[in-house]
Each structure stands twice: as C-alpha cells, then as structure tokens.
Interface confidence: medium
C-alpha cells in the first residue's frame, strides 16, 4: 500500500488552519467524510464528521473544528481555529464508514503549532488547489487581527484544475452539470 507523503503546516498559536481535501467524486459523492487526528501509537481519533444527506453541501461545527463539504466541487474543507501548541500532530481527511476501515483522502497533514509574537514573520499556507506537491508558503507579517491561513490573493494563473464548478438543479434533484474549463 502507498503511504502518502505528509504535508507540513507550520503555524503560530491563535491562527486558523484551512485544509482542502479533494476526493474522487464518482466514488465518494455519497459517502460520509471525517477529519481525524492520528495520535502516536494509538487508534485514530475522529474529530468531526459530515452529516446526511452526504450529496448536499453542508457545514458542520464541532468546537474548534469546521467541516465544509461540497460534493459538487469534490472538495472537503477543514478548518481548525484558535490553534494551540497542543494541537500539533498528524491529521487526515477520510471517507468514514465504520466498521469499515477509513479511506484516506489525499495527503495527511502534519500540523506544527508554535508560540509566537505578533511581530515575527511566519509562513502562511495558501491551501488552494495545489500547484506543487508541497503546500504553497508565503512569508507574511503576522498580526493578531489576521489569524487565518487563507488570504485574499489573486488566483494563480497556473491553477487550472477543476474538481467541479457548481450545481444545477435538474428535475428537483442535485445534478452537477460541470464545465471543466481550464
């Protein structure tokens, strides 16, 4: 079995982690998804799961965790707010259907949270559609009023992959008629 390479996210206490996990929509559109933590040497800990019906866009909040699931975009977005040093660890997006083994979606996330002052330069991850194997790092000055890792930056012109582009209602059902423009 393939072991997917980890993606390391280095953040500072108080920041928000945003991760986007693409999934194979033809296989997993109707499946429950979850965000799990992988404690060393222990069973995976399921932190938050999507709610039925899995074929419709949904948003689930569980403490500091938020799952935004949009099957029409073949994307599961995870947010962890107000990060603390104790949140450091290994996380993953999965297809969750106990008692079956979870299916890992994309690269596991190695989160490293450190204490930091408001006047240091910290790497900020722009978790948009990936251009490369590694997350995109942008060095930016951190301020207490700006605590999220996602920024309003122009979409890089090289980002042309489309997991999906919207839902059209056909005969009262969710039918995704997608343009795959590049």
């Amino acid at each position: 079995a393939i072991v997917l390479e980890e993606e390391r996210y280095d953040l500072v206490e108080g920041q928000t982690l945003t991760v986007k996990c693409p999934f194979n929509i033809m296989k997993y559109a109707n499946s429950q998804k979850a965000w799990q933590r992988l404690p060393d040497g222990k069973e995976p800990l399921t932190l938050v799961v999507t709610q039925r019906p899995f074929t419709r866009p949904s948003e689930v909040h569980m403490g500091k965790f938020t799952l935004k699931h949009d099957p029409s975009e073949a994307m599961l977005q995870v947010q962890m707010t107000d990060l603390q040093v104790t949140d450091s660890g290994l996380y993953r997006c999965v297809i969750y259907h106990p008692p079956n083994d979870p299916v890992v979606l994309f690269h596991p996330v190695r989160l490293v949270v450190t204490k930091g002052s408001s006047d240091v330069f910290t790497p900020v991850i722009i978790p948009i559609t990936r251009l490369t194997e590694r997350p995109i790092l942008i060095t930016t000055k951190y301020s207490p009023s700006d605590t999220t890792t996602t920024r309003s930056l122009p979409k890089p012109t090289a980002v042309v992959s489309s997991p999906g582009l919207g839902v059209t209602i056909i005969n009262g059902t969710d039918a995704d008629s997608v343009s795959t423009s590049s």
Epitope: N24, A29, P163, T180
Partner: antibody, heavy 126, light 107 residues
Amino acid sequence: EVQLVESGGGLVKPGGSLRLSCAASGFTFSSYSMNWVRQAPGKGLEWVSSISSSSNYIYYADSVKGRFTISRDNAKNSLYLQMNSLRAEDTAVYYCARGPSQYYYDSSAIEAFDIWGQGTMVTVSS
Amino acid sequence: EIVLTQSPATLSVSPGERATLSCRASQSVGSNLAWYQQKPGQAPRLLIYGASTRATGIPARFSGSGSGTEFTLTISSLQSEDFAVYYCQQYLYFPLTFGGGTKVEIK
C-alpha cells in the same frame, strides 16, 4: 461475463447528430459510474464525459460541453451519448467504460475504468 | 487541468528485459492514478489502479509505484504480448486526463 457493447457510430456530416448507446451486462449497472472516452485515429485517449450511478453528477470535457449529453437508463442497463453539432475533430473511436462503484466499502471496488467496450467509430466528414 | 507527461514516447526493449515507464503529473494527484495497456485495434485494458494495485488477472510482472506527481510502471520481464501502448490516467480531478502514451516496441 461482464461486458460493455457500444453501438450507434457511423458517418455523419459536420453539424449533424448521432446517438451512441452502450449496453451493459454481467454486473449491477446501477451501482457504477459510467464514462465515455474517445480516441482519434492514431492519437491517444481523451476523456469525454462521466455520469454517476444515479445521474446526480455529470461531467463533460470542455471540447464537447454544450454539444454532447450523457445519460443512462438503469432499468435498461444502458448508457447513452447524444452528440449534436458534430465537428471533424470529433472523429474518433468512442469507448464506454465502467467507473468506480459508489460503494467504496466494497473491498473489490476499483477506482479507475476497469471494464471497456470494444468501441464504435464515429466519422464526421462532408 | 492536470497534465500527465509520459516518458519516453517510445521504448525499444528486447523480450525478457525490464521496461520502466514514467508518468509525471503537473500537480499532485495523491495515489489516484491508473495505468492502461492498449494493443492495436483493441480497447484499453486496466493494469494498475491506486498507483500500485494490480487489476484482476494482471500478471505479477506488472507493477506500479509512486505517489503525488511521479509514477512508474515497471514490466519486470517483457513477454511478446506486452508490446503495446501504455497510458497513465489521473482520476482525482475533472477533467479526467490521460498521458500521451508510451509505445513499447520490440528492439
């Protein structure tokens, strides 16, 4: 025996229409997403369109969007591709291919296109 | 869209020798990659999915490896029936895309 059989190809003038069919047998058709893939003479494979098991999710390549329509009839175990406003560059062998089952917890589920038909030739020429 | 680049375009190998085919993705597709074999006048046949899992009935001499952006199909000892065109395909993102193919021919 698991099988896909395409039909409906032929010679058509530019701007014309054709409807391709793909008859499935030997498996539970309604559990699988289905796809159309084409191959122009002497060229590589090009994905054309996909449809999920219950027709909720439909995808098209840019090159055919607005001209081609994929559909399926699970009661008849059939997949279709309605092709309108045909162009010379649509000339190709069209294959239907079985995609993954929606039931990922089926340990035998395969994620790619595991079953292909023999193909049907579509020629667009005046 | 995800561009898959296969190399080499043509590979000349003697029967019994090892063949190594490469597929590079323009951005990471995890392990959502398949390999197909196509012989003249025939439909493609699935060899490998999930980057490394052999499809039913595929001989053990075919193996796939890699994840992310770099993938390899290895045929450990080429048999006469293995001379064909091989395509990789990613199925994580739409549009689903295929590589341009590698033709494995007899040296």
